[in-house]
């Protein structure tokens, strides 16, 4: 399987909410012995390997934000801790996997990574990640809503997030 990031860049005004998204692509084994660990974390540019460094999102580590479930099952993070920090990660039946960040501030700007680990018989068979950038802007140059930029070079038009 692979992880796709529909959007490589999210540009949002301060105070707005944003949902960063990754998508699980390819055949997903639904055997009872196969589960998926999914999580989010911040990283930094300029590394040899993007997403190798795992830094917290609003003081929550990738361990705090993880989901663990079988195949394309739906799941949500434990609400209390994450929601206190204005965060919620979720996964649906179609392989979409997201983190919602509420009331954005300039400090939220940076590189975000999603990580998916396929676990079979308590062995981590595959680890794949996706990366995307969040820019939080303030002042007259800031957009009124979040603007997202597709990862694919063919899609040159901006898509405004609902």
């Amino acid at each position: 399987f692979k992880v796709a990031t529909p959007y490589s860049l999210y540009v949002c005004p301060e105070g707005q909410n944003v949902t960063l998204t990754c998508r699980l692509l390819g055949p997903v084994d639904k055997g009872h012995d196969v589960t998926f660990y999914k999580t989010w974390y911040r990283s930094s540019r300029g590394e040899v390997q993007t997403c190798s460094e795992r830094r917290p999102i609003r003081n929550l580590t990738f361990q705090d934000l993880h989901l663990h479930h079988g195949g394309h099952q739906a799941a949500n993070t434990s609400h209390d801790l994450a929601q206190r920090h204005g965060l919620e990660s979720a996964s649906d039946h179609h392989g979409n996997f997201s983190i919602t960040m509420r009331n954005l501030t300039l400090l939220d700007s940076g590189l975000y990574c999603c990580l998916v680990v396929e676990i079979r018989h308590h062995h981590s068979e595959h680890r794949v990640h996706g990366a995307m950038e969040l820019q939080v802007q303030t002042g007259k140059d800031a957009p009124s809503n979040c603007v997202v930029y597709p990862s694919s070079s063919q899609d040159s038009e901006n898509i405004t997030a609902a």
Partner: antibody, heavy 120, light 111 residues
């Protein structure tokens, strides 16, 4: 070669906690989960759970949930298993164990075991 | 949880004679083409050592007098000619489903 070296024997009182360590060498520590299996005197083997050493993500046997905590320290390639609210039935040898190469799901490597005695 | 039931619980065998231990799972432990049942020998004062993996595969370094067979719910460990060094407790184990479970053990003694 793969080696799993465990901490020494412990004697604990009922209600107390015990923390057993398992230091791994001879392979890339974060490539494999580490499992814990216990064996009461003269009894069989019981799987307690395992920890994903890269993610620090534990998976416990339901029977021990709430009493067992598995953690790891990647800087020393060491895994820890802490069992709380000890009772006499927890007197056992506690083994750390690792799956075979490529994560094949059978216990190819074992520590020598740590005897934990719970007695008032 | 899958219950693994071994028979017999003890066995006394003359050196050079064969021995057989049975292990029955409470539900199938097959996944695709594999049977996730394994056999271990535990000698006194030692941790268990792997003998057979995936029902019938001999672990490296284990004498070929040991063999395993079976699928689904019924599995057998055979020793073609028992030797003095084979004494100990034999365990079957399933890893098809969490929690992983072991049989209660079969103690092999030499007559």
């Amino acid at each position: 070669q793969v080696q799993l070296v465990q901490s020494g024997a412990e004697v604990k009182k009922p209600g107390a906690s015990v923390k057993v360590s398992c230091k791994a060498s001879g392979y890339t520590f974060t490539d494999y989960w580490m499992h814990w299996v216990r064996q009461a005197p003269g009894q069989g083997l019981e799987w307690m759970g395992a920890i994903e050493t890269s993610l620090n993500y534990p998976s416990y046997n339901q029977k021990f949930k709430g009493r067992v905590t598995m953690t790891r320290d990647t800087s020393t390639s060491t895994v820890y298993m802490e069992l709380s609210s000890l009772r006499s039935e927890d007197t056992a040898v506690y083994y750390c164990a690792r799956w075979g190469i490529y994560g094949n799901p059978w216990f190819a490597y074992w520590g020598r075991g740590t005897l934990v005695t719970v007695s008032s | 949880d899958i219950v693994m039931t071994q028979t017999p619980l003890s066995l006394s065998v003359t050196p050079g004679q064969p021995a057989s231990i049975s292990c029955r799972a409470s539900e199938s432990v097959d996944s695709y083409v594999n049977s996730f049942v394994h056999w271990y020998l535990q000698k006194p004062g030692q941790p268990p050592q792997l003998l057979i993996y995936r029902a019938s595969n001999l672990e490296s370094g284990v004498p070929d007098r040991f063999s395993g067979s079976g699928s689904g719910t019924d599995f057998t460990l055979k020793i073609s000619r028992v030797e003095a060094e084979d004494v100990g407790v034999y365990y079957c184990q399933q890893s098809n489903e969490d929690p992983y479970t072991f049989g209660q053990g079969t103690k092999l003694e030499i007559k």
